[in-house]
């Protein structure tokens, strides 16, 4: 922001009214006025430039200095070309003297020069030269000094004038001040610019209405310099929650908008499934049935749990299921949704019911499920299963109710067992199988069959209670289809599938290879 | 040493014209502003009319303007003025005066110009 | 136009008198004034500019004074050679008018 001057004196302003003092007494300077675009001016003005050793004083009024700590002066004068006059002048000068004092009291017209310092010479950029003074065009020449810091009640200047002839058209002395400034919602009060130039006045901000320091942000802080100009912004202040930034102000939130943090970010408005909200509201409250998760941003609307899985199916696999759903008509307006799998069986006997989780085998966790299938295996025959799939998303926690569908499945047979082929040789294969431990006690025998491949004729049966067989008197070289059965007391369980397993052929006899 | 020499005057009869002129010397005439400056008999000075020392700007007292006119030529170092619809209160002795802003020991210009030199005048009389 | 009036139009004095002439302007104009000196049947001679500044080549003797409206010349020891009329102008305006006179004549 600009810098904001603050005048002590102005000579031009006063038209001629000031009286200011001359030494000698009557010699020298001179009050004059002219006439300049049809205005009359006032100037002090010298001319002695014929005679030598000119030392011709001109001293302000007292000027007081209130804050002031450093001053400025800006001067508008003119000088005449010293060749414009006769022979030159050869005692002709084209510069003057710029001093000061400063004093606790006004000494009137007690002029001492030793008080005074000096602040530098004043030197025309232009000179006015015979052309111009006839034409009355007037080379007005700018100059501003700088003195500080100032300790005295008040101060004089002086002007010195060795020979030149000069006329002051202006003098204006004042001081800078960081104008009062409103930036980043802080407010900075009006204050005085330092006096040494490399020194930065530090400045503190106080945030407007409804705003504040953001958490972790640094106080408002400007650097008032020398020249009256603010720098060096550090920290900021937000508006508050409710609040947003309208120009340089903070603005409570319109009615159906919202500001739920200390931010820069602006209002916004209520979000789908949310009650009107108030002037200057911090968040929108849901409507009844909708709920807000506590990770949903306030700016998300309000959802509610999902429906049931639209569609759930149960297929059996001997001693497995394949559970598959489709995802709820209604999400809840969420996309967080996951399944959850329970598992119940019963005996048909007894109708007696129990949880199954601990028996049973999932294909993946569970809980948490987001894909829409799972499937369930180490059932027991001869078993009544009911599964649940229910639906959840992230504000189901916030009701009592649940969304679910179920599906019921009996297991009548055993599982497959799991056949390998643990050795062999040119005349026999030596063939184990496992089934789940839970099905193990309803087996009563296992039954292989097995036959030379493209044999549809004829097959043999081999029973054992035990988990492996060697089927022996068969052909070198040759591939079996081999498949094992689990017999119990309701009948027969599921078959494996049919395996393909070669004797070796003659040249490899010499020991038996798995 | 500065030198004004005014010629041209004489005897015209009311309605008529005349021109007069001034030979300047001793001086550098194209730095001077110069003048017209005239006396009636037994009266006190009125300024006629001035032209600035490249021939420009001009200016004439109210009591001539429209009838008079100023003009100089640097080159022959000589002022003119020509009068024309003379009237019998033009009557008066004149004079061509010069200012030389080198002589004017001032800052600023004045808003107009005081006379430094004069020459000795030339009678113009206007009668039936 | 800026009328100037001068006071006394005429004064006697004697050899080494001090004799100060008034000139008033009709409105104020600051320290443009000059004065002038003529005797019978010769061209005015400038004495005095911007008031107070003495031209070249003019006694000391003279001295001139004022601003605004109120202007005064000062001859502070009359010589033979002064008794002349004495005439002030303005040169505040483009009309350069002048004072009716102020004849000095010998007592």
């Known amino acids: 922001a600009q810098g904001k001057e603050v005048v002590l004196l102005d000579f031009a302003a006063a038209g001629g009214e000031l009286g200011w003092l001359t030494h000698p007494y009557g010699k020298g300077w001179d009050l004059m006025q002219n006439i300049m675009n049809d205005m009359p001016i006032y100037m002090y003005s010298v001319c002695n430039v014929m005679s030598g050793d000119q030392d011709n004083w001109l001293r302000t009024n007292w000027v007081y200095r209130g804050e002031a700590e450093r001053i400025f002066i800006e001067l508008k004068f003119t000088v005449r070309d010293c060749n414009s006059f006769p022979g030159g002048a050869s005692s002709c000068k084209e510069t003057f003297n710029l001093y000061y004092a400063e004093s606790d009291l006004d000494y009137g017209t007690n002029f001492q020069k030793r008080l005074f310092t000096k602040i530098d010479t004043i030197a025309p950029d232009e000179i006015t030269v015979s052309s111009d003074f006839e034409a009355r065009h007037v080379k007005l020449n700018v100059e501003e000094r700088s003195v500080g810091p100032l300790t005295r009640k008040g101060f004089y200047l002086a002007f010195q004038d060795i020979g030149a002839c000069v006329a002051l058209l202006s003098v204006r002395v004042y001081y800078k001040k960081c104008p009062e400034l409103l930036q980043s919602l802080a407010r900075f009060p009006e204050t005085i610019a330092g006096s040494d130039a490399p020194s930065l006045a530090t400045v503190a901000g106080t945030c407007v209405d409804h705003a504040v320091v953001p958490p972790g942000g640094e106080e408002p802080r400007m650097h008032c310099a020398v020249d009256g100009e603010w720098l060096v912004p550090i920290g900021q202040c937000l508006c508050q929650a409710g609040y947003e930034k309208v120009e340089d102000a903070c603005q409570a939130c319109s009615p159906g908008f919202f500001k739920f943090e200390v931010s820069e970010s602006p209002c916004l408005e209520c979000p789908e499934h949310t009650l009107p909200s108030p002037e200057g509201a911090t968040s929108c409250e849901c409507e009844e049935g909708f709920f807000r998760a506590p990770q949903d941003p306030m700016s998300m609307p309000c959802t509610r749990p999902p429906s049931a899985p639209h569609y759930l199916t149960a297929v059996g696999m001997g001693a497995k299921v394949e559970l598959r759903w489709t995802p709820p008509q209604d999400s809840g307006g969420r996309e967080d949704i996951v399944y959850s799998v329970t598992c119940e069986q019963c005996w048909p006997e007894s109708g007696e019911c129990g949880p199954c989780e601990s028996s049973v085998r999932y294909s993946e966790p569970p809980h948490g499920l987001t894909r829409t299938s799972v499937t369930v295996s180490d059932l027991e025959p001869h078993m009544n299963y009911t599964f649940t799939v229910e639906a959840r998303n992230g504000v189901s926690g916030l009701v009592t109710s649940r969304s679910f569908r179920t599906a019921s499945v009996s297991i009548n047979q055993t599982e497959p067992p799991k056949v390998r082929l643990e050795g062999r040789s040119t005349t026999s294969l030596s063939v184990s199988w496992s089934i789940p431990p839970p099905q193990q006690s309803r087996v009563w025998k296992y039954e292989v069959t097995y036959r030379k491949k493209g044999d549809s004729n004829s097959y043999n049966v081999r029973r054992t209670e035990g988990f492996s067989v060697t089927l022996d008197d068969l052909a070198p070289d040759t591939t079996y289809l081999v498949q094992v059965q689990a017999l119990t007391q309701e009948g027969q369980g599921a078959g494996s599938k049919v395996h393909e397993f070669q004797t070796l052929s003659p040249e490899g006899s010499g020991s038996l290879a798995v | 040493e500065v030198q004004l020499l005014e010629s041209g005057g004489g005897l015209v009869q009311p309605g008529g014209s005349l021109r007069l002129s001034c030979a300047a010397s001793?001086?550098?005439?194209?730095?001077?502003?110069m003048a017209w400056v005239r006396q009636a008999p037994g009266k006190g000075l009125e300024w006629v009319s001035r032209i600035g020392p490249s021939g420009g700007p001009t200016h004439y007292a109210d009591s001539v303007k429209g009838r008079f006119t100023i003009s100089r030529d640097n080159s022959k170092n000589t002022l003119y003025l020509q009068m024309n619809s003379l009237r019998a209160e033009d009557t008066a002795v004149y004079y061509c005066?010069?200012?030389?802003?080198?002589?004017?020991?001032?800052?600023?210009?004045?808003?107009?110009?005081?006379?430094?030199?004069w020459g000795q005048g030339t009678l113009v009389t206007v009668s039936s | 136009d800026i009328q100037m009036t001068q006071s006394p139009s005429s004064l006697s004095a004697s050899v080494g008198d001090r004799v100060t002439i008034t000139c008033r302007a009709s409105?104020?104009?600051?320290?443009?004034l000059a004065w002038y000196q003529q005797k019978p049947g010769k061209a005015p001679k400038l004495l005095i500019y911007?008031?107070?500044n003495l031209h070249t080549g003019v006694p000391s003797r003279f001295s001139g004074s004022g601003s605004g409206t109120e202007f005064t010349l000062t001859i502070s020891g009359l010589q033979p050679d002064d008794f002349a009329t004495y005439y002030c102008?303005?040169?505040?305006?483009?009309?350069?008018?002048f004072g009716q006179g102020t004849k000095v004549e010998i007592k």
């Open positions: 911007k008031a107070s």
């Open positions: 102008q303005q040169y505040n305006s483009y009309s350069r008018t």
């Open positions: 005066a010069g200012y030389d802003s080198g002589y004017d020991y001032v800052a600023v210009a004045g808003p107009a110009e005081y006379f430094q030199h």
């Open positions: 409105q104020s104009i600051s320290t443009w």
């Open positions: 001793g001086f550098t005439f194209s730095h001077y502003m």
